[in-house]
Interface confidence: low
Amino acid sequence: CRTSECCFQDPPYPDADSGSASGPRDLRCYRISSDRYECSWQYEGPTAGVSHFLRCCLSSGRCCYFAAGSATRLQFSDQAGVSVLYTVTLWVESWARNQTEKSPEVTLQLYNSVKYEPPLGDIKVSKLAGQLRMEWETPDNQVGAEVQFRHRTPSSPWKLGDCGPQDDDTESCLCPLEMNVAQEFQLRRRQLGSQGSSWSKWSSPVCVPPENPPQPQVRFSVEQLGQDGRRRLTLKEQPTQLELPEGCQGLAPGTEVTYRLQLHMLSCPCKAKATRTLHLGKMPYLSGAAYNVAVISSNQFGPGLNQTWHIPADTHTEPVALNISVGTNGTTMYWPARAQSMTYCIEWQPVGQDGGLATCSLTAPQDPDPAGMATYSWSRESGAMGQEKCYYITIFASAHPEKLTLWSTVLSTYHFGGNASAAGTPHHVSVKNHSLDSVSVDWAPSLLSTCPGVLKEYVVRCRDEDSKQVSEHPVQPTETQVTLSGLRAGVAYTVQVRADTAWLRGVWSQPQRFSIEVQVSD
């Protein structure tokens, strides 16, 4: 037989299909010019020493073969002995290691069999009524096609589906959309209405994310507040990566999940901007304020569920960084300034009350005064911190108050509002005999003691009403009792107590008179 002809003899190997898992498959045959035809196939398994034979049976029942050698593609003309105008059945037999492996058969009319291309170029993916819609440009001169898709998830094998007939310059397909797993799709086409025409190759993978982006499973930790009044938010656990089907691993455009970090600064509500959205990879520095943090996942189909955390305020307080002076015109606060042209936010709230009751005030950008201090003043009429109770004060600073992540904490401290010196006066002062020359003086804690760090000390004053001599005794702010000794029997004394802050001397309590009775010996 001539090599260019289909040989109508028995092939040069025994006729037996081994039933092996490897072998030839995906046979495709089509017309490539007015009188030339091509068949191609794939071979699965080791290729060393394999010889391929293209088999053809005519409608008359006569069969022939082409010897392709080790090639998996073969061309022949309409003069090769194969009937191109009538239906023929073709298959490939591969002879290897003393056994024959056989491909599935294709039955077609070669003259009308056109080589169809799979969808080429950009396949657009969108969501339509809970399904996946794929759309692509029809390859040139190939309008009129039957289209199939196959899809798989990371844990399931390929499943086949039909897109139906297509007859336009653009083709489309509705496919199942998985809620929670990524999918890989491939598409193939064949000539519409041509009996037995060959399918094209499968297209390149189209990788599709799940309808719902995965919920971000991340954990945060917040570092200690640094000297600059800022603390770093760090990611303890990266979001879990979406598991991808085999053909989407590596580069998988379309399945990307983006994670964004949404910050909401709860403290200092009088500032201009309370929320900011950032990329998750860019972990911000925060002030010591309270924040809500949300991680939002999204993919090409939109946003998914988010995960939210509350980051509580840093409650570490500075002992004396804040100076407060109360004058007739009002009250002024002084603190070490941060830098030139800083905006400060002063926030205060009564201790023991819900954070929602915080009040704040924003200063205009200010430079340090000659002593390097920043100030904030308010009048008595404004009512700010006017009640005689303990307030928690936090001062934040920023050179760019419109940028949420550039605020820092200057200080946090406690302050007793209103007329602290009078309100702090200790009450219920009582005197009890202790010994022949001493007494124990007790009093109820000053209201100032409810305000951490405000009460510096108590002072107990004892006055000898005879000699008018006065002695004063400092007492630790945590104590509410002192023993006065060296007293004389029969002498009248008065005792008073006052409570002092770091910058204010308290008001003396009502004088309490007492004397130690003279002991009469028998």
Epitope: S156, P157, W158, P176, M179, N180
Partner: antibody
Framework: QVQLVQSGAEVKKPGASAKVSCKAS????????LHWVRQAPGQGLEWMGW????????HYAQKFQGRVTMTRDTSISTAYMELSRLRSDDTAVYYC????????????WGQGTLVTVSS | DIQMTQSPSSLSASVGDRVTITCRAS??????LAWFQQRPGKAPKSLIY???SLQSGVPSKFSGSGSGTDFTLTISSLQPADFAIYYC?????????FGPGTRLEIK
């Protein structure tokens, strides 16, 4: 109709291996994953792993890692599960189950194979 | 591993009754939950998948509901063939795990 037919009961000595087969019919064998599940006498069900008949890929439960091997022979549409270094607490009925298309739930089960491990 | 718990562990009912079995997962599993029926000496039979979808060929007297961590299987109008052990199974996270089973007995 879809059928999964398993091999017959076996009695094994501790330390030996048991190989159970599961022959599929009524569908394209390479299109659906097969899972293996076991049930000790009077106990509940325990998942062991799966095999993808299409390419031989497997995933085993951590508990059985190193002792279980799942294989398949596509020419006869049969999957195998071999458990080695048998212990008496491996005495159980072993089932193969087919995974549905489009989801990873099971739809069809084999009739089960009792493996008894006894000295 | 995800723990699956079922309640009650056993249940007595009469022919014609309607019964509900609950299944709880130790963490959220979406709707990746299946229910199986097992009669004595037989292989499990698949009833429900995806928490509420009926397997083909299973009568509509069986219904499932739930999502996340809490799920229920309801069987209406009990027949003698329905008295068996019912198992739930999560197939969201490896290893797939089954509930301990609920034994449904004739009163």
């Amino acid at each position: 109709q879809v059928q999964l037919v398993q091999s017959g009961a076996e009695v094994k000595k501790p330390g030996a291996s048991a190989k159970v087969s599961c022959k599929a019919s009524g569908y394209t064998f390479t299109d659906y994953y097969l899972h293996w599940v076991r049930q000790a006498p009077g106990q509940g069900l325990e998942w062991m792993g799966w095999i993808n008949p299409n390419n031989g890929g497997t995933h085993y439960a951590q508990k059985f890692q190193g002792r279980v091997t799942m294989t398949r022979d596509t020419s006869i549409s049969t999957a195998y599960m071999e458990l080695s270094r048998l212990r008496s607490d491996d005495t159980a009925v072993y089932y193969c189950a087919r995974e549905m298309g489009g989801t990873t739930a099971f739809d069809y089960w084999g009739q089960g194979t009792l493996v008894t491990v006894s000295s | 591993d995800i723990q699956m718990t079922q309640s009650p562990s056993s249940l007595s009912a009469s022919v014609g009754d309607r019964v509900t079995i609950t299944c709880r997962a130790s963490q959220g599993i979406g709707n990746y939950l299946a229910w199986f029926q097992q009669r004595p000496g037989k292989a499990p039979k698949s009833l429900i998948y995806a928490a509420s979808s009926l397997q083909s060929g299973v009568p509509s007297k069986f219904s499932g509901s739930g999502s996340g961590t809490d799920f229920t299987l309801t069987i209406s109008s009990l027949q003698p063939a329905d008295f068996a052990i019912y198992y739930c199974q999560q197939y969201n996270i490896y290893p797939y795990t089954f509930g301990p089973g609920t034994r449904l007995e004739i009163k």
